[in-house]
Amino acid sequence: CRTSECCFQDPPYPDADSGSASGPRDLRCYRISSDRYECSWQYEGPTAGVSHFLRCCLSSGRCCYFAAGSATRLQFSDQAGVSVLYTVTLWVESWARNQTEKSPEVTLQLYNSVKYEPPLGDIKVSKLAGQLRMEWETPDNQVGAEVQFRHRTPSSPWKLGDCGPQDDDTESCLCPLEMNVAQEFQLRRRQLGSQGSSWSKWSSPVCVPPENPPQPQVRFSVEQLGQDGRRRLTLKEQPTQLELPEGCQGLAPGTEVTYRLQLHMLSCPCKAKATRTLHLGKMPYLSGAAYNVAVISSNQFGPGLNQTWHIPADTHTEPVALNISVGTNGTTMYWPARAQSMTYCIEWQPVGQDGGLATCSLTAPQDPDPAGMATYSWSRESGAMGQEKCYYITIFASAHPEKLTLWSTVLSTYHFGGNASAAGTPHHVSVKNHSLDSVSVDWAPSLLSTCPGVLKEYVVRCRDEDSKQVSEHPVQPTETQVTLSGLRAGVAYTVQVRADTAWLRGVWSQPQRFSIEVQVSD
């Protein structure tokens, strides 16, 4: 027989399996080119003086052999007499020390037995029900695979695992996930359902961080609001270094833990962008708005546990900075402009209600008017601040409204909405005798008094119905009582009260008639 052919004769040794524990095993055969094939196997035991023979039986029942000598790998062509298009049964017989040792048989169609590629390119790693899920695109035109993985941690050797059969354009594997240590994974594939097919090489390492990314130690402090309407957020952190398995040291793609600072500006919900994520370590400047700040540690699986802080709004108010004029067409606010081409966010919310009920309006970028003021107007029909109640107003400004960290606070103040003149009219005005020539007038607090800084004063008016003389008495906004003296017994008087703001004169209450009875001596 020619060495390049499978010899259809009896092999040159007796046919008897010694049944020993040593011998050939793990036979793998595959196609290596259009017309060539290769079989390889392992040999367990002393190798001195061992001769290997690759045996092949065709579906017709005819059998042949290739003599491999001491080699454990053998190549042959499609012209070697082995039927490659049809199923054949192959095994190895090793002749040593006057005995024959046989490997387990493999039955396969050599023509289709190609060595698969390992997972190539991007292996996506995610977490699924406490396990690790790896997913990759099946290498083109190699659908139908068995997949294995091996994994190790910085302190443990490789452990082998099975991903099970795969039969789709994407393949996946569920693997164990470690809570607190990084792991290195590698994957390999072989043809599904083909006995004796060869495993691919191992894939490049897939480095996987622990399920729980280490938490940073963070402390925040917020400075006072400066003249520019901004305050600095400062923080400190000590990131933890992760110990990595051997194949992940150096670059270690996949095991990185990143710490990010997520700012959520709670105020001014009508602006374009409410959240901004920054690298931890940058020191952002904030407006006087309320913020939620989170430090998010994340790894390949996405965010881990985060630490969240609430930064309350700076509630320092400047009641004089805002000028409000109410006209027949609507209401206009004026305030000192910040700079050229500024966008302003005017936010208002009824006092005493949840912050979630804040309403706001964003102005188009505007330049200061000749008086250096910025303005915002609204009509009565718009319904803005139309209810007769106290509103807390904050105005924010930004030259770049799309950038969350560039907003500043212009002012915060209170405003009474709707028809403040009428709504502020004091009710329940009552008059009580105080002495022979004086009375005590008191009233229920004006609704304007619920609005800090809005009520400038009360004015009490007393009119002598006989002489038509009128006297007016200013009363502090914190008081709801005044004593009128110098009155004459038997004269009819009417008393009225009104509540004034810095910009508006109030509406008089209903006239209250009274007189001091003439005292008759016995």
Epitope: R31, S33, S34, L85, Y86, Q109, Y111, N112, V114, Y116, E117, E137, T138, P139, D140, N141, Q142, V143, G144, D168, D169, Q191, L192, G193, S194
Partner: nanobody
């Protein structure tokens, strides 16, 4: 699903050359191999050859060995297989069909191993 469309057929003189193309679209990553078959009136469809796509390994029927060459080109979501036919003979006159299989146990000489087929293109070799 996989769609196959052949092109390039026509009339050619004996000894001449022709190149057929077969464009596969659809779920092409799942295709294991693509082959060429031919059929003349009143006869069974016979294998011309096949290419295993992931490796480029080819098989040829004895009647075309040395004259015909199968190759393939991969693009995004499409695979094009070519059949370069040289030294054409009158017995090569037939309708040529492109086929694709998704299983790893297929025998390239058997038509029933292929799940997908093209509509065919006529090749006529005249003397």
């Amino acid at each position: 699903e996989v769609q196959l469309v052949e092109s390039g057929g026509g009339l050619v003189q004996t000894g001449g050359s022709l190149r057929l193309s077969c464009a596969a679209s659809g779920r092409t990553p799942s295709i294991v191999a693509m082959g060429w078959f031919r059929q003349t009136p009143g006869k069974e469809r016979e294998s011309v050859g096949e290419i295993i796509l992931s490796k480029g390994f080819t098989y040829y029927a004895d009647s075309v060995k040395g004259r015909f060459t199968i190759s393939r080109a991969n693009a995004k979501n499409t695979i094009t297989m070519y059949l370069q036919m040289n030294s054409l003979k009158s017995e090569d006159t037939a309708v040529y069909y492109c086929a694709a299989r998704q299983n790893w146990s297929g025998n390239p000489t058997r038509t029933n191993e292929y799940e997908y087929w093209g509509q065919g293109t006529q090749v006529t070799v005249s003397s």
